[in-house]
Each structure stands twice: as structure tokens, then as C-alpha cells.
């Protein structure tokens, strides 16, 4: 089944997809679908990669990540109720029924009203020993360590706090990048 | 060291073919992205696409699909482009550029440009 | 295709200068942005790939930073041989687009 994510209307967000290159600089085709994930290909594509490039997307979705070093985690820009629904990732690699497909659920909430600006989550907390930050300022690194032997307890740990959208928010606006292995 | 030497100045009548050649040497040829960019007289720098050597893959700017082919010989390490159905706004000087995974696919050495006259 | 925005078009300069030129995504780019450099009758040549990573060789004085789709190249003391049209390029998607260019000149 599906790994749910959610995000308020007028955020962006955030929908995670992971993959290693076989070795540096070979990237596969990755598509991303409205929809889950069909036999071959991807229904309803927003975006697709090739060997080296983005060479297809609509308006409002892109890779913030380093796509080329395998993360291919999909941005959706300003959500709407409408951007609800499943979401299929489809790592191609080469070879019959070799594809990688993750079906990831998209839950858009109304946006909240708050009369306040409250303290954002301190998601190095939520992370120790795993981010690589990456500031505002001009190429200034950060480094509060490395993951050395992550297992699936961990992985799974972390996919249930990446589905709280407003941490993967404050995630992606820092710039920080989850490195797992 | 690594070298991209390009064929010379081409005069062509509105309508013809152009074939331009690109030899590299000093690094292995297959395993780099050969891009091809012109820049028109006075103006800014355009990609027409590349070829990966290795696979024979092209990508081509949509702009140009139908009238540009990119072809490359590995036993003499050279890069073809070629632009059919010339016009006179295709005067410009077109580039050989190599690009690897190393820069993200930037163009980090390029050939010394080819002069290509469009004129009736 | 993606269009990148480069201003401003001419620098007047002097020897020792700092000079900072932007260039603007018409979407995000994630850090896939490239600097060239021109100098008349000369190739380009790289010197900033994905955003803040200098080349192999290229002096210090030269920078890039940004994300998403603001984009800033600079070089801290400009010296006589910076004189050159310089061009931003996003290398994230195809067609690969190129900034206009910056041309700097003498003051």
C-alpha cells in the first residue's frame, strides 16, 4: 500500500523518491505519474528525466534535489485540493520488469488560519546525525554528520517522519538533503 | 591534454546542407556527452543538443528537430553535426563542447568554433 | 523551455572592482545553474557548474551562489583579464538556455 504525505493549499510538497546509480553518471529514466503506477511507464506524467536531463514537465513540478546523484524527490508548487491523490515514481531501469515503482499518496488539507506565527519545528532534533545543511549564505556547508550503518528500522522511521509535510517543507527550505547509507 | 579541433569556415546558399566535424583527443571519447552550441553574430549562446558516443543517444533542441542530426565515428574520435535546410539566420559560429557527470553536464572544453555563412 | 533572465546587460568597471551580475530562472532549477566566460574571438569557458562549485583552475575571486531560481555570479576584485561577456546556463533540463550575457567593460 501506498506511504502517505500531507501538505496544507498553498504549500509546496514534498513527495520522496530515492535511487543509487549503478556507478557515478549512470543515471536511468525516471518518470513521475498522477496516478499509480501502471505495468510499464507512468500514467498521467508531470515529469520525466533521461540519462542526463529533465526532458519533460508541467508547470508547478520540478526536482529540487540532485536528481543526478539519485534523488529524485517530486516538488509540487502551491497545491491545491486537486493535487490529491496517489503519485507513482518509476525508477526505468534497463531490462524487462526491472523498474523500481513507489506509489506515494498525496493528502491536501485546507490551509489553517493562525492568528500567530508559531515557532517552527526544530528538525535537526528530528534528524540527529543526518543532515547535511546547506545555508543561505553564499556556499556555506554545515555538516552535523553522517548516517554510518542505517537499517530498515531507521529507513522506516524516517519515511513516518517525512510524511509530517510541514518538516519536509522546513527540509527543502533549508536546503538540507537526506543522505541514507 | 585534452583538444576539440573543428572543421573550417563554410559558405552555404539559403536551403543547402552543413556538415561540421569536431575531433577530440586526449581523453576518452565514449565516455563523455558531446554538445553542440552556436552563437549567432553579436549575440547570446544557443544548444542545439548533444550525442553520448557510447550509445549513440541524441537529444535535440525542438527548435531544430528535423533539421539537425548529430552522428559520431569512435574509431577517429570525431563529432558530426549537421544542419539541413539552412537559412540565412542560421549564420553563426557553432561550437563543439565536451560534458561529463563530473560537472553536472556543464560544458568544460570546447572546440575553437566554426564559422558557418548563410548568403545567397 | 526554461528562460534565464541575466542583468544587467553592461558593467562599467575598474581594476579592483567587486562586480556581481544575477541571472533568474523563469522556474526552479534546483542548483543546475553554469558560468561561462567570453572573451572576444575566444570559446567559452567554464567556470561555475552547479551553482557554487568553481572549475578546476579558475582563480577564487570568482563565486556563484543561489538555488531554485535566483542566481548570482561574482568576482570579488575584478582584474584587466575579467574584462569578457559572461553567461549563465541552467543545465537541469532540455533544452539546455543560456542568460543573454554581461558584458563587462572599462569604466
Known amino acids: 500500500s501506498e506511504v502517505e504525505y500531507r501538505a496544507e493549499v498553498g504549500q509546496n510538497a514534498y513527495l520522496p523518491c530515492f535511487y543509487t546509480p549503478a556507478a557515478p553518471g549512470n543515471l536511468v529514466p525516471v518518470c513521475w505519474g498522477k496516478g499509480a503506477c501502471p505495468v510499464f511507464e507512468c500514467g498521467n506524467v508531470v515529469l520525466r528525466t533521461d540519462e542526463r536531463d529533465v526532458n519533460y514537465w508541467t508547470s508547478r513540478y520540478w526536482l529540487n534535489g540532485d536528481f543526478r546523484k539519485g534523488d529524485v524527490s517530486l516538488t509540487i508548487e502551491n497545491v491545491t485540493l486537486a493535487d490529491s491523490g496517489i503519485y507513482c515514481c518509476r525508477i526505468q531501469i534497463p531490462g524487462i520488469m526491472n523498474d523500481e515503482k513507489f506509489n506515494l499518496k498525496l493528502v491536501i488539507k485546507p490551509a489553517k488560519v493562525t492568528p500567530a506565527p508559531t515557532r517552527q519545528r526544530d528538525f535537526t532534533a528530528a534528524f540527529p546525525r543526518m543532515l547535511t545543511t546547506r545555508g543561505h549564505g553564499p556556499a556555506e556547508t554545515q555538516t552535523l554528520g553522517s548516517l554510518p550503518d542505517i537499517n530498515l528500522t531507521q529507513i522506516s522511521t524516517l519515511a513516518n517522519e517525512l510524511r509530517d509535510s510541514r518538516l519536509a517543507n522546513d527540509l527543502r527550505d533549508s536546503g538540507a538533503t537526506i543522505r541514507i547509507g | 591534454q585534452v583538444q576539440l579541433v573543428q572543421s573550417g569556415a563554410e559558405v552555404k546558399k539559403p536551403g543547402a546542407s552543413v556538415k561540421v566535424s569536431c575531433k577530440a583527443s586526449?581523453?576518452?571519447?565514449?565516455?563523455?556527452?558531446m554538445d553542440w552550441v552556436r552563437q549567432a553574430p553579436g549575440q547570446g549562446l544557443e544548444w542545439l543538443g548533444y550525442?553520448?558516443?557510447?550509445?549513440?543517444?541524441?537529444s535535440y533542441n525542438q527548435k531544430f528537430k528535423g533539421r539537425v542530426t548529430m552522428t559520431t565515428d569512435k574509431s577517429t574520435s570525431t563529432a558530426y553535426m549537421e544542419l539541413r535546410s539552412l537559412r540565412s539566420d542560421d549564420t553563426a559560429v557553432y561550437y563543439c563542447?565536451?560534458?561529463?557527470?563530473?560537472?553536472?553536464?556543464?560544458?568544460?572544453?570546447w572546440g575553437q568554433g566554426t564559422t558557418v555563412t548563410v548568403s545567397s | 523551455s526554461i528562460v534565464m533572465t541575466q542583468t544587467p546587460k553592461f558593467m562599467p568597471v575598474s581594476a579592483g572592482d567587486r562586480v556581481t551580475m544575477t541571472c533568474k530562472a523563469s522556474q526552479s532549477v534546483g542548483n543546475n545553474v553554469a558560468w561561462y566566460q567570453q572573451k572576444p574571438g575566444q570559446s567559452p569557458k567554464l567556470l561555475i557548474y552547479?551553482?557554487?562549485n568553481r572549475y578546476t583552475g579558475v582563480p577564487d575571486r570568482f563565486t556563484g551562489s543561489g538555488s531554485g531560481t535566483d542566481f548570482t555570479f561574482t568576482i570579488s576584485s575584478v582584474q584587466v583579464e575579467d574584462l569578457a561577456v559572461y553567461f549563465c546556463?541552467?543545465?537541469?533540463?532540455?533544452?539546455?538556455?543560456f542568460g543573454t550575457g554581461t558584458k563587462l567593460e572599462i569604466k
Open positions: 550525442i553520448y558516443p557510447n550509445k549513440g543517444g541524441t
Open positions: 586526449g581523453y576518452t571519447f565514449t565516455d563523455y556527452y
Open positions: 546556463q541552467q543545465h537541469y533540463s532540455s533544452p539546455s538556455t
Open positions: 552547479y551553482a557554487s
Open positions: 563542447a565536451r560534458s561529463g557527470y563530473g560537472n553536472y553536464y556543464t560544458m568544460d572544453y
